[in-house]
């Protein structure tokens, strides 16, 4: 019989229910915004905004300072008081819509839903390793602002994204706000604008450049700004918006908007549609060609990538890539396929595509029928004409007007659908060594830290753990502070090490020592941990073999048994070839001689499963006693593998030496032609791995084997005669003298 070791699923080597406790801060209300600061004198801070309050935390998440940002009209509102005696507007709670650092000063800028969306500037005052906020400055000049023209009205109650860019000695705020008719009518916020902070911190300079959804589209055309960032010469906004001004407003797609970070003007404002799809390796019948679209961006982050992912994306290591988590619709629940997919868009490629789109619009000969687009911001026109005009005038340039690039940028899910039911709600990407890691927060309050790699059919987890017991969604915005990421969930802020929260979720030594170097995992006798958790026994260089099972569970006291051992860390080499003298197996007192691997039986093991097999021939010593005993595998002097060497002993109970006994054989005669069904009765007849019933030295073909009975069909006899009948188990004869009589047919 050809017994094979049962497969161990790869997942059995880890436990994602292991509890990790990471430092946290209870903010006293739903966290609305969070940003971190790291100074050049080793001082750092975390700023956390909730309704009506702004907390300043130290790097240890201990509260350093707290500031009242509302309610507007309340005498205890510190930011409101900075604007001088009121009233400044209708009273009401302040929900923080913008919390950003102005790196030039440095200062923290906060903008809320109250007081016409005005902002406040807080100088950062580093003292030791802590940072304090100076008294707030009100970025609002009453005499400069009117309902129809308000440079100091920044935040929209529907959501605003801001990126601050230094240009010369000035700070420019790149602002993108979601609007509707009601918001637009109140102190005229703009959809996209670039505003210069006045040097005296009294507000923003008037006459700023802006784009806004045209009044006729405000009711039906809503733009959600999901993310903004600055890299290279540009500022980028990521939006989710209706695919068309005229069609169904619920048919959404994702766009990237690009603005110049070096010139505070919007003539070179460009948009590009981002297309993310799930393309399963084997396409289901009826599934769309090119994969299932995931048009709605949920979260995004841009980061330079490590060597491995860079190679897969065919870009240079360290190049900036925009990563986005996409879902099928606003509710995020798809029919088939995963809940969330992750697509990677190299920034350099995005820029190239945009630049080519501009050339296509503006070059001659003209491409007939090519629209300038952005009809929700500007009058419709065809390239190369400016918006609303029939033709270019001599003193205008086609390139100096906003443009929607006509082609979209399409990518497929990096994870090949492996996120499955997980709903990702937060994303931050880091480069660790040459590995690119996605740190993801989920709808059910978990953190997944996964290597970003394309070529596998399983996820490579750094960790997968629950942030707390509340199970509340992890919020969109993630901040980095040193070697930690800050995630918010409910009213809590959590500090998660970039290297992962620990190693205890790796259950086997092999999995532990195969973990990424940056995790700092080592084996501590019987668990995986970091050095600080078990300084005494911690090591990273070897693993003992691990026996999980063997077959058979019994063997004859006389005679040999072919023993198959199952487990892990036997070889470290896929070929399973064992150097001479490295593996020693004993069963009780008896040695088990290693057998060479039968190359014809080698089969590829999918990486999602793992098991190692080792075969040996057991020949009990004369001194071996009947009864239960242990199987022991000792590996020494093995050459090291890629991650560690195998060294040590594994012992498993449950093998028994038995003495087969033959009690009865019937019938004792049969036709010379053979074919008589012999029944041999006794005890321990099924022990070991081989048995043979010999009739006059010829094998009687076994039909059934059980512990107490063997059935076999007699071979043909040469002549009519009484011939010897014997039973061999493991090649050794079972005591007893039996004959079988061949008779005429």
């Amino acid at each position: 019989e050809d017994w094979q070791c049962p497969r161990t699923p790869y997942a059995a080597s880890r436990d994602f229910d292991v509890k990790y406790v990471v430092p946290s801060f209870s903010a006293g209300g739903l966290v609305q915004a969070m940003v971190t600061y790291e100074g050049d004198r080793n001082e750092s801070a975390v700023f956390v905004a909730i309704r009506n309050r702004l907390h300043v935390l130290g790097p240890d998440l201990k509260s350093v300072q707290s500031l009242a940002t509302g309610p507007a009209g309340d005498p205890g509102c510190q930011t409101c008081a900075a604007c001088g005696p009121g009233p400044h507007g209708p009273p009401g709670d302040t929900d923080t819509k913008v919390l950003v650092l102005d790196p030039a000063l440095p200062a923290l800028v906060s903008c809320g839903s109250s007081l016409q969306g005005r902002c406040f500037l807080h100088d950062l005052e580093p003292q030791g390793t802590a940072v304090h906020l100076a008294a707030p400055a009100c970025l609002f000049s009453a005499h400069h602002n009117r309902p129809d023209d308000c440079p100091d009205c920044v935040a929209s109650p529907l959501g605003t994204r801001v990126t601050v860019v230094e240009q010369g000695q000035a700070s420019y705020f790149y602002v993108a706000s979601s609007l509707d008719a009601a918001v637009a009518a109140s102190f005229s916020p703009r959809s996209v604008s670039i505003r210069r902070l006045k040097a005296d911190a009294s507000g923003f300079a008037p006459g700023f450049v802006a784009l806004s959804v045209l009044p006729k589209h405000l009711v039906s055309y809503s733009i959600e700004y999901v993310h903004s960032f600055h890299t290279g010469a540009f500022v980028y906004f990521l939006t989710v918006q209706p695919a068309s001004v005229t069609d169904d407003p619920s048919a959404l797609h994702t766009r990237l908007a690009r603005l110049s970070a070096t010139e505070p003007e919007l003539g070179d404002y460009r948009e590009l549609v981002l297309d993310c799809r799930f393309a399963p390796k084997r396409r289901r019948r009826g599934a769309p060609e090119g994969g299932q679209p995931y048009p709605v961006l949920r979260v995004a982050h841009s980061a330079p990538v490590g060597a491995q992912l860079a190679t897969e994306l065919s870009i240079a290591e360290g190049q900036e890539v925009l990563f986005g988590v996409f879902v099928t619709g606003k509710d995020g629940g798809p029919g088939v396929g995963p809940n969330s997919v992750v697509c990677a868009f190299p920034i350099d490629l995005l820029d190239t595509l945009i630049d080519e789109g501009v050339e296509r619009c503006c070059e001659s000969p003209v491409h007939p029928g090519l629209r300038r687009g952005l009809d929700f911001f500007q009058s419709p026109s065809f390239c190369p004409n400016p918006p609303g005009l029939e033709a270019l005038s001599p003193n205008t340039s086609c390139r100096h007007f906003p443009l929607l690039v006509s082609s979209s940028f399409s990518r497929v899910d990096l994870f090949n659908g492996l996120l499955g039911p997980v709903q990702v709600t937060a994303l931050y990407v880091t480069r660790l060594d040459n590995v690119t890691v996605a740190h993801m927060g989920t709808m059910d309050g978990r953190i997944l830290q996964v290597e970003l790699v394309r070529s596998l059919n399983y996820l490579l987890y750094v960790s997968n753990f629950s942030l707390g017991d509340s199970g509340q969604p992890v919020q969109r915005d993630v901040s980095r502070l040193g070697d930690h990421l800050l995630f918010a969930s409910g009213d809590q802020v959590f500090q998660v090490p970039i290297q992962g929260p620990g190693c205890r979720h790796f259950l086997t030594c092999g999995r532990c020592l195969r973990a990424w170097h940056f995790m700092g995992c080592g084996w501590c006798g019987n668990m995986c941990g970091q050095q600080k958790e078990c300084p005494g026994s911690w090591q990273q260089d070897h693993c003992p073999p691990k026996l999980t099972e063997f077959h058979p569970h019994s063997g004859p006291l006389r005679g040999s048994t072919r023993l198959t051992l199952c487990g892990s860390n036997f070889y470290l080499h896929p070929s399973g070839l064992v150097p001479e003298g490295t593996h020693q197996v004993t069963v009780g007192q008896s040695p088990c001689r290693p057998l060479p691997k039968d190359s014809s039986k080698l089969r590829p093991v999918p990486r999602k499963d793992f098991v190692e097999e080792f075969e040996c021939e057991l020949e009990p010593l004369g001194t071996q006693a009947v009864g239960p005993t242990n199987v022991s595998l000792t590996v020494t002097n093995m050459p090291p593998g890629k991650h560690f060497r195998v060294d040590g002993t594994s012992v498993l109970r449950g093998f028994s030496f038995m003495e087969p006994v033959l009690i009865a054989v019937q019938p004792l005669f049969g036709p010379r032609a053979g074919g008589t069904c012999l029944t041999l009765e006794g005890q321990s007849l099924s022990v070991g791995t081989s048995r043979a019933v010999l009739v006059n030295g010829t094998e009687c073909l076994l039909a059934r084997v059980s512990e107490g009975q063997l059935l076999c069909a007699t071979p043909p006899g040469a002549t009519v005669a009484s011939v010897p009948l014997s039973l061999q188990v493991g090649g050794a004869q079972v005591p007893g003298s039996w004959t079988f009589q061949y008779r005429e047919d």
Epitope: S66, A68, A201
Partner: antibody, heavy 117, light 108 residues
Framework: QVQLVESGGGLVQPGGSLRLSCAAS????????MSWVRQAPGKGLEWVSY????????YYADSVKGRFTISRDNSKNTLYLQMNSLRAEDTAVYYC??????????WGQGTLVTVSS | DIVLTQSPATLSLSPGERATLSCRAS???????LGWYQQKPGQAPRLLIY???NRATGVPARFSGSGSGTDFTLTISSLEPEDFATYYC?????????FGQGTKVEIK
Amino acid sequence: QVQLVESGGGLVQPGGSLRLSCAASGFTFNSYSMSWVRQAPGKGLEWVSYISSRSSTTYYADSVKGRFTISRDNSKNTLYLQMNSLRAEDTAVYYCARGYFHGMDYWGQGTLVTVSS
Amino acid sequence: DIVLTQSPATLSLSPGERATLSCRASQSVSFDYLGWYQQKPGQAPRLLIYGASNRATGVPARFSGSGSGTDFTLTISSLEPEDFATYYCFQALIMPFTFGQGTKVEIK
């Protein structure tokens, strides 16, 4: 050790001007908010003006608003108070003080400003 | 403006006695932003307590601060001769910053 030394006080006629200076040493000047506080003879303390560490934010008591200007030069570790249109009620000892959130933890010894004809 | 009212205006006590000084705000003041200062004649003020209850560097343990909202207290558990001075409370919560009018602790 932390030291704050005020200078520039003196006798000035009503309507006149003075510029007070406060030389700071012994700490990282550009990390701290600074304030001017005054004390009229035989009276209590009155906060006059505040400036944040990087001059982004300035505040004044209503009694001096529009007449006094606070400023700082972080490269010289010096705080200033420009006082214009001085009145008799501005007569006081003027102190400069360091800090905001954790209180004004260090004070100078003060400089006397007398406004009289 | 937040008005801080200190009471009593004068406190006459002997060395070794306990002194309790009160400061009442016209509106609620976050404890983070309330401090106490000591001033002796001819000297600059000295910070004693910040954040309503935190002793400043070098301040003896006999000084303690407490309170929240609108009522704050400075307690000197056992008066030493050098403690006879004028004490001011101060708020930095809302502009303009304001001092109380002071409480003079004199030797009985």
